[in-house]
C-alpha cells in the first residue's frame, strides 16, 4: 500500500503562437481543479476505462477573472497535493491521464457548470520511495508543469511497496496464514495483494500483481463469464474445486445482483445496476471511495471521502448510472427536430437536417420561400417549414392572388368614413379627428396631438399615413 | 474488532448429519467471502467450504462436495455448514473464517485469505 502523490506546478499558454484564450471572463469567471487517473501498465488504454489505480480530485482554485485585454497567463491553482492511494503493490510502469476542468460561477440554472479544459496522458516507469519526478505536458495550446512521486505507508517499504511487514499481535505466533517477516522476526508477514482490479469473487492471486480466475470466468481481473455450464474439472490448491451457478430459465432468474443490485437481462447474459457504494459485475464490490476512481467515461467523483460515506458520479454527457458507466442512448430523446436523423457519434451528437432546415438540432428553417413566388408585389416571409406571403395593400390569400378590400377590418378611428383607392385606403375624419386613421382627436385651441415629426421631417410637412 | 463464534459440533455417527453455526455477534459482514475449515489431529489445516458473502459463489473441497452445503443467513448474520453422510476421517476441529473487506489474495479455500478466526469446534465422528 502506499499513495502516488501529484503536485501541479503551472498550467497556461504554452510556448510559441497562437496563445489560447483565457477560460474565464468578467462575465463568467471560474476557477479550476484537476482530476488524476491512474493505471497499470504502460498499455494504450482507452480514456473510459476504469482508474484501476485509483484516482483524485483536486481542492478548487481561486477564483479567476480574466483582465481585459490581457494575454491568458498561468492560472491560479488549487493549493496541496493530488494524493492517490493504492492499496495493492505499486506496478513500477503506470499509465496516467490528467485533465484540468473549468467550473463557470457564473449564474448558471442549476449551479456551476463543468467544462473540462485539457487533458494530458503520458506512460512512465517509476519505482516507489524515489525523489519527485518533473515533467511537462502540452494539450493543444496549453501547457501543464507537474511533478509525481510514489511513496509507500508504512508498513510497507521497497520500491513496489511489496514488503509489508507490521507487529506480531503475540510473541509466540503470527496469526493464521502470516509468517515471521524474514529478516524482522519480530514483525509478521501481511497478506498478499493481487492485480488492481482483479475481482474479490471470482478471482485471486498467490504471486504479487497476478490475476487467476475461478472457473467459469474469464478476462484479466476476472470479470466475464465464460459459459453457465462451466461445472467440470477441478482447480486451485488442495484439489479444490469451484463452485458454478446452475442457470435457471432466464440469466436474471435468483438475482445474480448482490447488495441491492437490480438485474436487467441482455442478449448473452445479464447486466447489474448496482447502488452507489457498489459496483462489479454482480455489484459484489464495496467499501467504494472517490480515491478508487469509481466513476467510469470521464466522471467526475464528488464527496466520499471515506468508505462510510456516499460517493456522487456526474457523469459527462452521454453517460449515466451511478458510476457513469452506462451509455445514453441519447437519440431515444429525438433531438433531431423538422424530421432530422441523428446520429449518436459517443462523443458528440449529430443532426443530419432534411432540405430546406440547418442547425445542430435542425431548428433552423432555410429557405421556405424557394420557388414560391407572392403575386402582385407581395413579399414571402419564412417560418415553420411553410411560406407565408405578406401582401401588398388591396391583396390577400395565401399568394397575395385575391384582391382585398381594404376597408373590411374597419380602419379608421373616431368614426371616420373608409373608401378604398388604387393605392390603398382613405379615411375621411368624423369632426374633431385628424390623421391617415382619424386616431388623433383636434384641440379646442387648435393644437392637435400629432406624434412627433419622424426624423428627416420638420414640424409642418406634409404627411402621409398610408 | 471482529468475533466468530462457532456452535453445532460434537458427537455422530457415521452417514449421520451436524449442522456447525458462525455467528458474528459484533460485526456485520455484508460482502467477502467466509470458509469453513478444518484441522485433524496431526494434520494441516484444509479447506472445506467458502461463500461470497453479497454475491452467488460458493466452493467446495473435492473430499466434502455433495456431502456438505455452506450458507449464509443474513438476517441472523450467521454462517451454516450443512454436513450430511458423514465419514470417520471427517473428524477434526473446524474452524469459521472471514474476510473484513474483500480482496482478491489468494484462493477462497486457501486460509492464507482470511484475517478472522473463529476458535473452532470439535466434530468427531465415530460408531
Known amino acids: 500500500a502506499g499513495v502516488f502523490e501529484l503536485q501541479i506546478h503551472s498550467f497556461g499558454p504554452g510556448p510559441g503562437p497562437g496563445a489560447p484564450r483565457s477560460p474565464c471572463s468578467a462575465r463568467l469567471p471560474c476557477r479550476l481543479f484537476f482530476r488524476v487517473c491512474l493505471k497499470p501498465g504502460l498499455s494504450e488504454e482507452a480514456a473510459e476505462s476504469p482508474c484501476a489505480l485509483g484516482a483524485a480530485l483536486s481542492a478548487r482554485g481561486p477564483v479567476y477573472t480574466e483582465q481585459p485585454g490581457a494575454p491568458a497567463p498561468d492560472l491560479p491553482l488549487p493549493d496541496g497535493l493530488l494524493q492517490v492511494p493504492f492499496r495493492d503493490a505499486w506496478p513500477g510502469t503506470f499509465s496516467f491521464i490528467i485533465e484540468t476542468w473549468r467550473e463557470e460561477l457564473g449564474d448558471q440554472i442549476g449551479g456551476p457548470a463543468w467544462s473540462l479544459l485539457a487533458r494530458v496522458a503520458g506512460r512512465r516507469r517509476l519505482a516507489a520511495g524515489g525523489p519527485w519526478a518533473r515533467d511537462i505536458q502540452r494539450a493543444g495550446a496549453w501547457e501543464l508543469r507537474f511533478s509525481y512521486r510514489a511513496r509507500c505507508e508504512p508498513p510497507a517499504v521497497g520500491t513496489a511497496c511489496t514488503r509489508l511487514c507490521r507487529p506480531r499481535s503475540a510473541p509466540s505466533r503470527c496469526g493464521p496464514g502470516l509468517r515471521p517477516c524474514a529478516p524482522l522476526e519480530d514483525e509478521c508477514e501481511a497478506p498478499l495483494v493481487c492485480r488492481a482490479g482483479c475481482s474479490p469473487e471470482h478471482g485471486f492471486c498467490e504471486q504479487p500483481g497476478e490475476c487467476r480466475c475461478l472457473e467459469g470466468w474469464t478476462g484479466p481481473l476476472c470479470t466475464v463469464p465464460v459459459s453457465t455450464s462451466s461445472c467440470l474439472s477441478p482447480r486451485g490448491p488442495s484439489s479444490a474445486t469451484t463452485g458454478c451457478l446452475v442457470p435457471g430459465p432466464g440469466p436474471c432468474d435468483g438475482n445474480p445482483c448482490a447488495n441491492g443490485g437490480s438485474c436487467s437481462e441482455t442478449p448473452r447474459s445479464f447486466e447489474c445496476t448496482c447502488p452507489r457504494g457498489f459496483y462489479g459485475l454482480r455489484c459484489e464490490v464495496s467499501g467504494v471511495t472517490c480515491a478508487d476512481g469509481p466513476c467510469f467515461n470521464g466522471g467526475l467523483c464528488v464527496g466520499g471521502a471515506d468508505p462510510d460515506s456516499a460517493y456522487i458520479c456526474h457523469c459527462p454527457p452521454g453517460f449515466q448510472g451511478s458510476n457513469c458507466e452506462k451509455r445514453v442512448d441519447r437519440c431515444s430523446l429525438q433531438p433531431c427536430r423538422n424530421g432530422g436523423l441523428c446520429l449518436d457519434l459517443g462523443h458528440a451528437l449529430r443532426c443530419r437536417c432534411r432540405a430546406g432546415f440547418a442547425g445542430p438540432r435542425c431548428e433552423h428553417d432555410l429557405d421556405d420561400c424557394a420557388g414560391r413566388a407572392c403575386a402582385n408585389g407581395g413579399t414571402c416571409v419564412e417560418g415553420g417549414g411553410a411560406h407565408r406571403c405578406s401582401c401588398a395593400l388591396g391583396f390577400g390569400g395565401r399568394d397575395c392572388r385575391e384582391r382585398a378590400d381594404p376597408c373590411a377590418a374597419r380602419p379608421c378611428a373616431h368614426g371616420g368614413r373608409c373608401y378604398a383607392h388604387f393605392s390603398g385606403l382613405v379615411c375621411a375624419c368624423a369632426p374633431g379627428y385628424m390623421g391617415a386613421r382619424c386616431e388623433f382627436p383636434v384641440h379646442p385651441d387648435g393644437a392637435s396631438a400629432l406624434p412627433a415629426a419622424p426624423p428627416g421631417l420638420r414640424p409642418g410637412d406634409p404627411q402621409r399615413y398610408l | 474488532e471482529v468475533q466468530l463464534v462457532e456452535s453445532g459440533g460434537g458427537l455422530v455417527q457415521p452417514g449421520g448429519s451436524l449442522r456447525l453455526s458462525c455467528k458474528s455477534p459484533?460485526?456485520?459482514?455484508?460482502?467477502?467471502?467466509m470458509g469453513w475449515f478444518r484441522q485433524a489431529p496431526g494434520k494441516e489445516r484444509e479447506g472445506v467450504a467458502a461463500i461470497y458473502i453479497g454475491g452467488s459463489t460458493t466452493l467446495y473441497a473435492d473430499s466434502v462436495k455433495g456431502r456438505f452445503t455452506i450458507s449464509r443467513d443474513n438476517s441472523k448474520n450467521t454462517l451454516y455448514l450443512q454436513m450430511n453422510s458423514l465419514r470417520a476421517e471427517d473428524t477434526a476441529v473446524y474452524y469459521c473464517?472471514?474476510?473484513?473487506?474483500?480482496?482478491?489474495?489468494?484462493?477462497?479455500?486457501?486460509?492464507?485469505?482470511?484475517?478472522?478466526w473463529g476458535q473452532g469446534t470439535l466434530v468427531t465422528v465415530s460408531s
Open positions: 459484533t460485526y456485520t459482514i455484508s460482502s467477502g467471502y
Open positions: 473464517a472471514a474476510q473484513l473487506r474483500p480482496n482478491s489474495a489468494y484462493h477462497p479455500l486457501d486460509g492464507r485469505k482470511y484475517n478472522y
